[in-house]
Amino acid sequence: MGRARDAILDALENLSGDELKKFKMKLLTVQLREGYGRIPRGALLQMDAIDLTDKLVSYYLESYGLELTMTVLRDMGLQELAEQLQTTKEESGAVAAAASVPAQSTARTGHFVDQHRQALIARVTEVDGVLDALHGSVLTEGQYQAVRAETTSQDKMRKLFSFVPSWNLTCKDSLLQALKEIHPYLVMDLEQS
């Protein structure tokens, strides 16, 4: 998605296994701004860096997600990583965005495909149809072939989602459009949940 998301992912991928564990534990107790919910402990502890980045952005959006990541990294004594994020924040203009009070009735969740990543991996069966819809516009030939090379639907979807962190909103919208076309009842079911 945006530069903030990429910066969060870079920072989390720079953490050792123990540091990532510590980051998650701190995230469970860090003071949150009013109006924001906490990522459930059970799900949080199982996440890798990519999943955690997705979750941070889906729960807190880019601007506040970036700020929260900086706070936790500073609390862990990882000043250098936090400073790198600070630079990204200033460059992207996220300062002004983060300063806004979250409005009631304004969603504080991520894009539909980020919110429902695990369910989509588990439940999308017509992956080839989805790939055909994304081929050329969103997926490169190499990415398209890499996903098709996987054997099961779940592995194909997992591979497809490995490309999602670098996507912008229009790319995610293209995936959502394809899902609405090919798996409408699944999308409706996930929306209810």
């Epitope: 909103l169 959502l176 609405k180 409706m188 929306e191």
Partner: antibody, heavy 122, light 107 residues
Framework: QVQLQQSDAELVKPGASVKISCKVS????????IHWMKQRPEQGLAWIGY????????NYNDKFKGKATLTADISSSTAYMQLNSLTSEDSAVYFC???????????????WGQGTTLTVSS | DIQMNQSPSSLSASLGDTITITCHAS??????LSWYQQKPGNVPKLLIY???KLHTGVSSNFSGSGSGTGFTLTISSLQPEDIGTYYC?????????FGGGTKLEIK
């Protein structure tokens, strides 16, 4: 509360360009896409496209490609739509609008600017 | 593009009446349909989303139904403030498209 404040009415000559602004308040501009609609007198609404200030991406209705350019300035919490090579067909009221909920499976528009009337006349 | 055909294009009814406006999509749009009300000189206002969900703050006199290609907006116990033009909008795929509108007047 969420508000979208559009720039004032414009009277421009054929062939010229115009840039309409939409200043948002009550939320972070980077947290939602801004969509633009066109409404001609006694006609329905047409979706022009959207721009997502969170990552700079945009999606246009083919009918408005080359006519409209959508941008945003995060520092001033303002989205813009530039319309070029104006003709009388571009005379209309233009609305900026924001989906009510970012994480939905489709966009339904709960917040609207007050509209900017564009008149193209020599 | 998905075409949205709305009928009738205009409608005159008496206070207290129940009226229905229909919207037909040129292809299956499941439940991804919204209804808006636009009063003269005002901006469109969201009434119904996802075909049948009443938007926050909207009178329960409004209701929506349908899925696939056929949709209905029903206004029960018509009030003076209900005059205006009503539009349906599909959110199944880009470009989003609107119905031509139904102008509602009070007899």
């Amino acid at each position: 509360q969420v508000q979208l404040q559009q720039s004032d009415a414009e009277l421009v000559k054929p062939g010229a360009s115009v840039k309409i602004s939409c200043k948002v308040s009550g939320y972070a501009l980077t947290d939602h896409s801004i969509h633009w609609m066109k409404q001609r007198p006694e006609q329905g609404l047409a979706w022009i496209g959207y721009m997502y200030p969170g990552d700079g991406s945009a999606n246009y209705n083919d009918k408005f490609k080359g006519k409209a350019t959508l941008t945003a300035d995060i520092s001033s919490s303002t989205a813009y739509m530039q319309l070029n090579s104006l003709t009388s067909e571009d005379s209309a009221v233009y609305f900026c609008t924001r989906p009510y909920y970012f994480g939905s499976s489709y966009d339904y528009f709960g917040y609207w600017g007050q509209g900017t009337t564009l008149t193209v006349s020599s | 593009d998905i075409q949205m055909n709305q009928s009738p294009s205009s409608l005159s009814a008496s206070l207290g009446d129940t009226i229905t406006i229909t919207c037909h999509a040129s292809q299956n749009i499941n439940v991804w349909l919204s209804w808006y009300q636009q009063k003269p000189g005002n901006v469109p206002k969201l009434l119904i989303y996802k075909a049948s969900k009443l938007h926050t703050g909207v009178s329960s006199n409004f209701s929506g139904s349908g899925s696939g290609t056929g949709f209905t907006l029903t206004i029960s116990s018509l009030q003076p403030e209900d005059i205006g033009t009503y539009y349906c909008q599909q959110g199944q795929s880009y470009p989003y498209t609107f119905g031509g509108g139904t102008k509602l007047e009070i007899k």
